[in-house]
């Protein structure tokens, strides 16, 4: 999917409203300062398609966050602002539906979502210069 | 341009209600959500209740299920906030707020309806006050 034509303000609303704060809630009891962030985006665009494959694409070690309320936000803010995504997400649904697996946090998600804090961040800044 | 004019408000009993309009103009009412929103002096502006005029959702704050109810008439371009068995504590400024990609994802907008910095347009509001 080209995020290009979301809308990249409502979707930083929405995440300063509320899908930040589920994030943090996830990763309680963790020190910030525990996982460094090997992720980094370069736009806007960039940012989401980064984000949508860290929330959404199992990963060794993580199977799965979907069912995670950040993620469950996630996906309804990408199919509101994000025109013509959630048709791109239907076959994506049908196939993680068959392979859903019972949720469990694992150190290895708990890193993941701590690369998804700060391709979120960098969302948010999008004229800061590329470190 | 877009308009949205709040009417209805006025001082109350406990108990009593009041139906407040929201009457828009200026965008393709069919395809929009519109939410009411209320602020009492001092406090955030919270969410009371949202509706899709595209498939005619409903969602409520807790504090007022039950006892609001949204509607929306499309053909007029008005939605309606009828309040019984109010409280003091629903008095309030109350708004009503537009947003466009919402009112066509109407499922989707169950986490973020009642989140003010999401909306596009408002009306200027008009006073709710119940007595005790």
């Known amino acids: 999917y080209d995020f290009t034509n979301c809308d990249f303000e409502k979707i930083k609303a929405a995440y300063l409203s509320t899908i930040s704060k589920d994030l943090i809630t996830y990763m309680s009891g963790t020190k910030s300062t525990e996982f460094n962030n090997t992720v980094s985006c370069s736009n806007r665009p960039h940012c989401l398609t980064e984000i949508q494959s860290l929330t959404f694409n199992p990963t060794a070690g993580c199977a799965s966050l979907a069912k995670e309320m950040f993620a469950m936000k996630t996906k309804a803010a990408l199919a509101i602002w994000c025109p013509g995504y959630s048709e791109t997400q239907i076959n994506a649904t049908q196939a993680m539906k068959k392979r859903r697996k019972r949720k469990v946090t694992t150190n290895k998600c708990l890193e993941q979502v701590s690369q998804l804090q700060g391709l979120w961040r960098r969302f948010n800044r999008p004229l800061l210069k590329q470190q | 341009q877009v308009q949205l004019v709040e009417s209805g408000g006025g001082l109350v009993q406990a108990g009593g209600s009041l139906r407040l309009s929201c009457a828009a103009s200026g965008f393709t009412f069919d395809d929009y959500a519109i939410t009411w929103f209320r602020q009492a002096p001092g406090k955030e502006r919270e969410g009371v209740a949202y509706?899709?005029?595209?498939?005619?959702?409903?969602y409520y704050a807790d504090s007022v299920k039950g006892r609001f109810t949204i509607s929306s008439d499309n053909a007029k371009n008005t939605v309606y906030l009828q309040m019984d068995s109010l409280k003091p504590e629903d008095t309030a400024v109350y708004y009503c707020?537009?947003?466009?990609?919402?009112?066509?994802?109407?499922?989707?907008?169950?986490?973020?309806?009642?989140?003010?910095?999401?909306?596009?347009?408002w009306g200027q509001g008009t006073q709710v006050t119940v007595s005790s």
């Open positions: 509706i899709s005029n595209s498939d005619g959702m409903t």
């Open positions: 707020a537009a947003e466009g990609r919402m009112g066509t994802h109407s499922r989707d907008s169950v986490y973020f309806w009642a989140f003010s910095a999401l909306y596009d347009y």
